[in-house]
Structure formats: structure tokens, C-alpha cells
């Protein structure tokens, strides 16, 4: 199904406009900002979601040490260019002709340049580390129960195949979720780890992208899991190219 047939809405993306103008009067939904048709049975790509967000009104030690090549999204929001499949174009530019290269999750992976900057290919982010800190609780969560709950969440809510959740680490109050997905592993129809991580990030912030679905209510054996900060690290199949100036 492309959208909920009974009331013509998109369950997986509230930032859409839907109407029964598809083949045979079927409900069809288009992303705000880009006008691209979206498949409402799965997650919408992060590129289209960012574009929609920018078009919307503004008021609307078992722990892993991230590698030296890990990227954090310090640039924040921008209005991206998406390809016809809804993926980020490798080169992004702003209105003042400043350009940079991004990875498959839209995070800058080079220094900023001008229109002459070349980005030969869209480099895949194959490893995402989601670093969470939970609010104080009476005691630590049972690691196995916490691990299973987060794996269930990614399967059920984000439709991410269980094979892509590589590990869940826990040292109270820090939780780390590792998502891994190589180009060769990702089959047609598989949710992209970058899209799942983005939906999760928005859920954690109380900004759910789902339509008509309650916000995220994470519980471990009935005990609420409340996240007070989130950091997401992105590792690309090819290390990023930044000048030494940025590293100092």
C-alpha cells in the first residue's frame, strides 16, 4: 500500500500532502518541499525529510570509542538537493555558491569550497553509533532487557532488519546503539540505517515523523527509559577529507 486508504494519510511521514489521485483512485502522498511521491509503507529518506522540514513554517568501557574518522552533524539543518530516488546528492551548495561534499546521511565530509568543488560519488555511511544518556533511575536497567527492547524498537517502529543492529552497549547511564549496513548487505526494500537513525533521533527529541501514532514511549519491563541527550556519530566507507586546519 502507498498510504492509508481509509483516510488518505501517510502513516510513516506526516510531512506530506496526500490525495486520492493515484492509479485507480488510490491514495498518493507527496513530500512537502520536493513534491516527490513517497512510499508510505516504509520510512521516507532523510534527504526528503530535511527538505520538507526546511519548507515547513519555522514555528512548526564496553562502550565504543568513535574512530578518528567519525563525523558528527555539527552543521545542523540545511535545504538539501535530493536525487530522483530521494537520496542526497554528493555535492550540496547553498544560495551563496558555497559547496561541500556529503555522505549518504547528508553530513558534510569535506571542507567547504566553491562551485568548482567536485564530489565524485556519494560515499556510504556504513556504521552509525547512537550515543544516548538516560535520566537517573532507581537502578540500572537489565542489560539484556534493554538490548532486546531497543532491537525490538528498530524492528517494529522503523522496520530496520535485525541484522543491521550490530550491538547495544550499556554502562549506566550511557547507552550506545551500533547500526551497520554495508552497500553489499543492503537489499532492495531494506530500510537504510541513516533513515532509521534519523527517525529515532526525531522520536527521541519528541518530534515524531509518524502520522497519527503516539510519540515514542520507551519502556524496559515497564520502567520508562527517558533520554536526556543524544549524540550520533557517522562512519563512512571512505574516510572524510578535511584539511588539517579543521582538525586543530
Amino acid at each position: 500500500h502507498t498510504a492509508a486508504q481509509d483516510n488518505c494519510t501517510c502513516p510513516t511521514n506526516k510531512m506530506t500532502v496526500c490525495s486520492p489521485d493515484g492509479p485507480g483512485g488510490r491514495c498518493q502522498c507527496r513530500a512537502l518541499g520536493s513534491g516527490m511521491a513517497v512510499d508510505c509503507s516504509t520510512l521516507t529518506s532523510k534527504c526528503l525529510l530535511l527538505k520538507a522540514r526546511m519548507s515547513a513554517p519555522k514555528n512548526a568501557r564496553t562502550l565504543v570509542r568513535p574512530s578518528e574518522h567519525a563525523l558528527v552533524d555539527n552543521d545542523g539543518l540545511y535545504d538539501p538537493d535530493c536525487d530522483p530516488e530521494g537520496r542526497f546528492k554528493a555535492r550540496q551548495c547553498n544560495q551563496t555558491s558555497v559547496c561541500w561534499c556529503v555522505n549518504s546521511v547528508g553530513v558534510r565530509r569535506t571542507d567547504k569550497g566553491d562551485l568548482s568543488l567536485r564530489c565524485d560519488e556519494l560515499v556510504r555511511t556504513h556504521h552509525i553509533l547512537i550515543d544516548l544518556r538516560h535520566r537517573p533511575t532507581a537502578g540500572a536497567f537489565n542489560h539484556s532487557d534493554l538490548d532486546a527492547e531497543l532491537r525490538r524498537l528498530f524492528r517494529e517502529r522503523y522496520r530496520l532488519h535485525p541484522k543491521f543492529v550490530a550491538a547495544v552497549h550499556y554502562e549506566q547511564p550511557t547507552i550506545q546503539i551500533e547500526l551497520r549496513q554495508n552497500t553489499s548487505q543492503k537489499a532492495a526494500g531494506d530500510v537504510d540505517i541513516g533513515d532509521a537513525a534519523y527517525y529515532f533521533e526525531r522520536d527521541i527529541k519528541g518530534e515524531s515523523l509518524f502520522q497519527g501514532r503516539g510519540g515514542l514511549d520507551l519502556r524496559v519491563r515497564g520502567e520508562p527509559l527517558q533520554v536526556e541527550r543524544t549524540l550520533i556519530y557517522y562512519l563512512d566507507e571512505i574516510p572524510p577529507k578535511f584539511s588539517m586546519k579543521r582538525l586543530t
Epitope: 532486546a148 524492528r155 543492529v165 503516539g214
Partner: antibody, heavy 117, light 106 residues
Framework: EVQLVQSGPEVKKPGASVKVSCKAS????????IGWVRQAPGQGLEWIGE????????YYTQKFKGRVTMTADTSTSTAYMELSSLRSEDTAVYYC??????????WGQGTLVTVSS | DIQLTQSPSSLSASVGDRVTITCRAS?????MYWYQQKPGKAPKLLIY???TLASGVPSRFSGSGSGTDFTLTISSLQPEDFATYYC?????????FGQGTKLEIK
Amino acid sequence: EVQLVQSGPEVKKPGASVKVSCKASGFTFTDYVIGWVRQAPGQGLEWIGEIYLGSGTIYYTQKFKGRVTMTADTSTSTAYMELSSLRSEDTAVYYCARGSIFPFDYWGQGTLVTVSS
Amino acid sequence: DIQLTQSPSSLSASVGDRVTITCRASSSVSYMYWYQQKPGKAPKLLIYDTSTLASGVPSRFSGSGSGTDFTLTISSLQPEDFATYYCQQWSSYPYTFGQGTKLEIK
């Protein structure tokens, strides 16, 4: 072709343990989840728990916690469910089922466990 | 735990009849799953994500609903449809099933 083949019927005495096996074929074993569900004679379906085959992560329902053990042998693509301290109410057909982005997409044929003195 | 209550518990109908089975959740769930079980056999996935037919399931089966109220409809009963039907949720641990609806020949 995806297949889950379970071990044969068992008759056990109260207080004993039973170990049911579920041999998988037709898919990459460690990419999936195996859930266990039981059905008492003439009754409905009751979920016991599940094991993530790649990581070994396990979740048991509260009712069975402490009495059930789920394991997997990746070398033989076989999942196991052991239930201890058996009582007559544990008489049921026990099913294994594969999980992916669905809770259960393929099921084993079931194993009848009879607990009787 | 989320309780699922199916109604009716049993139902007699004839070939060609339209049949509706409802499943009510004790709290809101994201999606409902439906299974068909025949005597002596394992359950078979019928409908996932509330309304999507599993592979090989005839189009006479349909599912709908949201929140706490869901339905399974068989538009024109066929002889092979006489079985027991279960709804199931996995929006939160533990996964739970409805008590089942036994569909019998009138």
C-alpha cells in the same frame, strides 16, 4: 525455501525439564530472530520469548523468566528452548517462529510436550 | 501488558458470506497482525502492518483499523477459510495474541 524443523514429541514427568530444538534452513541464520510460542490443548497462542541469533540477545516474558532458557547453535543453525520445573499446565504444542521486520513470518511444525505423572 | 480481545469468539457462516472479526487492544498499538490456524497445523501469517496481505494470501482477505480497534474481513468465504484466526501486536513487550476466533461452517 525457508524451513524450521522442530524435534519430536516429548513426554515428561512433573518437575523435569524439556529441551525443544528448531533447525533452520533456507536463510542466513544469524540475520534473524527466533521466537517461541506455545499453545495448550484447545487454547490460544501464548508468546514465551525470543532470541536474536546474531547477538544472542534474549527476551523472556515475565511469566517464564527463571524457568526458560533459549539458546542457539550457529554452527548447526539450530535454536533451542528449554523449560524446567515442568507442571501439568505446561502441556502444550511449542512452536518456534522466525522473526525479521515481522514478529513471526515462518513457523515450525510444532512440538507436543506432555507433562504427566 | 497489552491485552487483545477478539470478537466474536466463534462464528458460524456459509460459503460466500462476508465475515468480519474485530480485535480491540487495551492500549494503542501501531499495527495489527493476523494469523490463520487450521487444526493440527502451525499458524500462518495472513496480514501484516494492519492491512497488507502476506505473500500468497487471496485478496478476499482484508484488514483495517488503527489505535485500539482493528478488523479482519473476508469478503466471500471459501471452504478453505474455515479455521481459527488470531490477532497479534508487537508494539511493546510482551507480544500478545487475541484469544482467537473460530470460524465454523453453518
